[in-house]
Amino acid sequence: LCQGSNYSTCASCPSCPDRWMKYGNHCYYFSVEEKDWNSSLEFCLARDSHLLVITDNQEMSLLQVFLSEAFCWIGLRNNSGWRWEDGSPLNFSRISSNSFVQTCGAINKNGLQASSCEVPLHWVCKKCPFADQALF
């Protein structure tokens, strides 16, 4: 049901694994502990998921309801411009760096924030239910 390329959207999917939240056609994992950006990415990949890639403003607004003031890592990095981990550019929201070390993106209830990738933060993974391959 959710088969396809790594960057397709889930179709109408069954329920999510334990400790994952179903929203729309995706499953989301909001971490309790904190890790740096790379370790957060590894955590998600090990669970057949990816650090959160937000597709549009609507998804961002919906997710922010579940967030607090605390920032969470998402799949956004500045490699000659802010891009999501699926390769798409950030084009529905703004994020700005205040220093050259702020090359990873995070989100809280108020919006996006650039940060040094070394800072330990909570993180959000996104996947299709179970082990399906369509991550975004």
């Epitope: 920032f71 205040n98 070390v101 995070a106 650039a114 040094s116 070394e118």
Partner: antibody, heavy 120, light 107 residues
Framework: EVQLVESGGGLVKPGGSLRLSCAAS????????MSWVRQAPGKGLEWVAT????????YYPDSVKGRFTISRDNAKNTLYLQMSSLRAEDTAVYYC?????????????WGQGTLVTVSS | DIQMTQSPSSLSASVGDRVTITCRAS??????LAWYQQKPGKAPKFLIH???TLAEGVPSRFSGSGSGTDFTLTISSLQPEDFATYYC?????????FGQGTKLEIK
């Protein structure tokens, strides 16, 4: 309350070495970039060194590169500055400073400073 | 390297005056500018980042403006405790350069 307390300053001869320490408290040391900034007597502020959270990345201006080494011990909440091949122009008050968080590299908190005098 | 130049290097003013200090960057630094206040024998105190955002606990009589190469720090109504030396600093990239300072003295 954020506290940064520098120590290790003193009188040293030209060509000599000195190690400064900065004991941090009141915040989670291992979440922040840390820096050293100095001020020669009667002069302005000069950035000396910055170290990343893990200590894996360090940055220096040309004036101290190859002579000064910044390091940190996150288990001891302590920042260090190893200074060698010291020159008269290194005479200054050395301040330890913490960034604003998330890699915002302005100097949000400062210690009281420790005086280094290089003279024969 | 980016150079930061402050003007004036010193100025005299009276309590209640409105004072403006200027900082000019040698090239476009967008809004990557911080301001600090330093009193004799004390460590600098952080006032403003990103050219205009006040640090926590800084009185509202302080304000920052500008972007690109020209920046200003304004004190709307000088208080006795404001007499000090003020420094601007480029905070985006290496090297983090400071202006030479502006000494604000009592007239």
């Amino acid at each position: 309350e954020v506290q940064l307390v520098e120590s290790g300053g003193g009188l040293v001869k030209p060509g000599g070495s000195l190690r400064l320490s900065c004991a941090a408290s009141g915040f989670t040391f291992s979440r922040y970039y840390m820096s050293w900034v100095r001020q020669a007597p009667g002069k302005g502020l000069e950035w000396v060194a910055t170290i990343s959270i893990s200590g894996g990345n360090v940055y220096y201006p040309d004036s101290v590169k190859g002579r000064f080494t910044i390091s940190r011990d996150n288990a001891k909440n302590t920042l260090y500055l190893q200074m060698s091949s010291l020159r008269a122009e290194d005479t200054a008050v050395y301040y330890c400073a913490r960034e604003g968080g998330y890699g915002n590299l302005w100097f949000a908190y400062w210690g009281q400073g420790t005086l280094v005098t290089v003279s024969s | 390297d980016i150079q930061m130049t402050q003007s004036p290097s010193s100025l005299s003013a009276s309590v209640g005056d409105r004072v403006t200090i200027t900082c000019r960057a040698s090239e476009n630094i967008y809004s990557a500018l911080a301001w600090y206040q330093q009193k004799p024998g004390k460590a600098p105190k952080f006032l403003i980042h990103n050219a205009k955002t006040l640090a926590e606990g800084v009185p509202s009589r302080f304000s920052g403006s500008g972007s690109g190469t020209d920046f200003t720090l304004t004190i709307s109504s000088l208080q006795p405790e404001d007499f000090a030396t003020y420094y601007c600093q480029y905070h985006y990239g290496i090297p983090f350069t400071f202006g030479q300072g502006t000494k604000l003295e009592i007239k």
